[in-house]
């Protein structure tokens, strides 16, 4: 099973050496967006109804305080990056902590300058990993030197960072916001007419959890080749569940030969193409 995870993504920008006021931030819980930083309100806000319903007001106060502090640190760090030429630059920090099935924990943070990874840190061991490129090496040295001057960036600070992240993750799990549950998908198949006797059939799976799903078209029970199908990304739907789709083109009149095959969390099912005038077939969830 995938570990439970809490991930924060912060970004600050600078233009011609001028660092923006404020920062951009979002948070993901078990891969689901649950938090965004509203720079107009200067507040962490719930993202998605599920986060708003389950997590109390104190959550957003705590998250705001922590993000503000992290954002200020990131702004100060960007100010000290020496190689800034003219133009727009970004400094991004992705911080992740995980709780695995065997109760072991992991914690890391990763720094990107203009989208390029230049430093990864293990928050438990304080070990740093720097990519081989000379630019990454220079940036990492630049940043770690600045942190050494900053008394806050001690080993105790990193341990506290990890403990704080895990504490939040455990609290969110207890609140039931990310209880490991299986929500089977709703599957529906739609047809749309296309010229020259071909039709496009689309199979949509929605409101499922966890994220992993197999969705594919079959002809006479055999899966179609990859290059004859078009897949959508598996995306959060804002309700703590996911959605995706797969489409293919078939000859009109051959609808009965095609089925949409779905496999999710050990369950599977096939969904036929609607024939004749009934161009939409809704397959209800079977819990």
């Amino acid at each position: 099973a995938e570990p439970h995870s809490l991930r924060y993504n912060l970004m600050v920008l600078s233009q011609d050496g001028s660092v923006q006021s404020g920062f951009l931030a979002e948070g993901h819980l078990d891969g689901q967006p649950f938090l965004r930083y509203d720079r107009q309100k200067r507040r962490a806000k719930p993202q998605g109804q599920w986060a708003e319903n389950v997590l109390g007001a104190k959550t957003w106060d705590t998250e705001t305080e922590d993000l503000t502090e992290n954002g200020q640190d990131l702004r100060r760090t960007l100010t000290h990056i020496k190689d800034q030429k003219g133009g727009l630059h970004s400094l991004q920090e992705i911080r992740v902590c995980e709780i695995h099935e065997d109760s072991s924990t992991r914690g890391s943070r990763h720094f990107y300058y203009d989208g390029e990874l230049f430093l990864s840190q293990n928050l438990e061991t304080q070990e740093s990993t720097v990519p081989q490129s000379s630019r990454a090496q220079t940036l990492a040295m630049n940043v770690t030197n600045f942190w050494k001057e900053d008394a806050m960036k001690t080993k105790t600070h990193y341990r506290a960072m990890q403990a704080d992240c895990l504490q939040k993750l455990q609290r969110y799990l207890k609140s039931g916001v990310a209880i490991r549950r299986t929500v089977p998908p709703m599957v529906n198949v739609t047809c749309s007419e296309v010229s020259e006797g071909n039709i496009t059939v689309t199979c949509r799976a929605s409101s499922f959890y966890p994220r992993n799903i197999t969705l594919t078209w079959r002809q006479d029970g055999v899966s179609l080749s990859h290059n004859t199908q078009q897949w959508g990304d598996v995306l959060p739907d804002g309700n703590g569940t996911y959605q995706t789709w797969v489409a293919t083109r078939i000859r009109q009149g051959e609808e009965q030969r095609f089925t949409c095959y779905m496999e999710h969390s050990g369950n599977h099912g096939t969904h036929p193409v609607p024939s004749g005038k009934a161009l939409v077939l809704q397959s209800q969830r079977t819990d």
């Epitope: 920008l13 233009q15 011609d16 001028s18 660092v19 923006q20 006021s21 404020g22 509203d38 720079r39 107009q40 309100k41 200067r42 507040r43 705001t64 305080e65 503000t68 133009g87 727009l88």
Partner: antibody
Framework: EVQLEESGPGLVKPSQSLSLTCTVT?????????WNWIRQFPGNKLEWMGY???????NYNPSLKSRISITRDTSKNQFFLQLNSVITEDTATYYC?????????WGQGTTLTVSS | DIVLTQTTSYLSVSLGGRVTIACKAS??????LAWYQQKPGNAPRLLIS???SLETGVPSRFSGSGSGKDYTLSITSLQTEDVATYYC?????????FGGGTKLEIK
Amino acid sequence: EVQLEESGPGLVKPSQSLSLTCTVTGYSITSDYAWNWIRQFPGNKLEWMGYISYSGSTNYNPSLKSRISITRDTSKNQFFLQLNSVITEDTATYYCARGGTYFDYWGQGTTLTVSS
Amino acid sequence: DIVLTQTTSYLSVSLGGRVTIACKASAHINNWLAWYQQKPGNAPRLLISDATSLETGVPSRFSGSGSGKDYTLSITSLQTEDVATYYCQHYWSTPWTFGGGTKLEIK
């Protein structure tokens, strides 16, 4: 509905301190946003003076830093501007406004004249 | 400090006409710009944020565009109630600053 209303003395003598109050109704100043003071000089030029955020942190325009203080009284849902050692060039209409980046709600403004 | 320049101080346009008001920043502000309308005796009113996002309740004849250092407020089909002074404001970095304003009149 969110409403902001400025109040103040109208006339202040040079070298004195100016104190203005912004009373907010329909929204708690401790909920979120930053709460700003902006002034408009007789020639219509607008100047952002500073803010106090919902958490109580402040940020001031460096051009006023040595003279300005923004505070609040959360029990009355009010925030205040104090400007020390005023000069005639501080004559302006003073507005309070809500916003952490841009300003979506403004008071109607209070006119302040600095004159002996 | 970032300086915002509104080169046109006054604009005279016919009713029903189209207006564009320019705002130039002294540095790139990456769309972190707002537009306000101010009528005599009133406080400024927010029209547009993030260079292009129209505020709720603002008529669709108003629109914002631009990027980098150069931004524009456009008004199509000018109405009498649009007579006002228009200001731009950036929020890239503090101190936040305003443009000098463009006063719009009916020809």
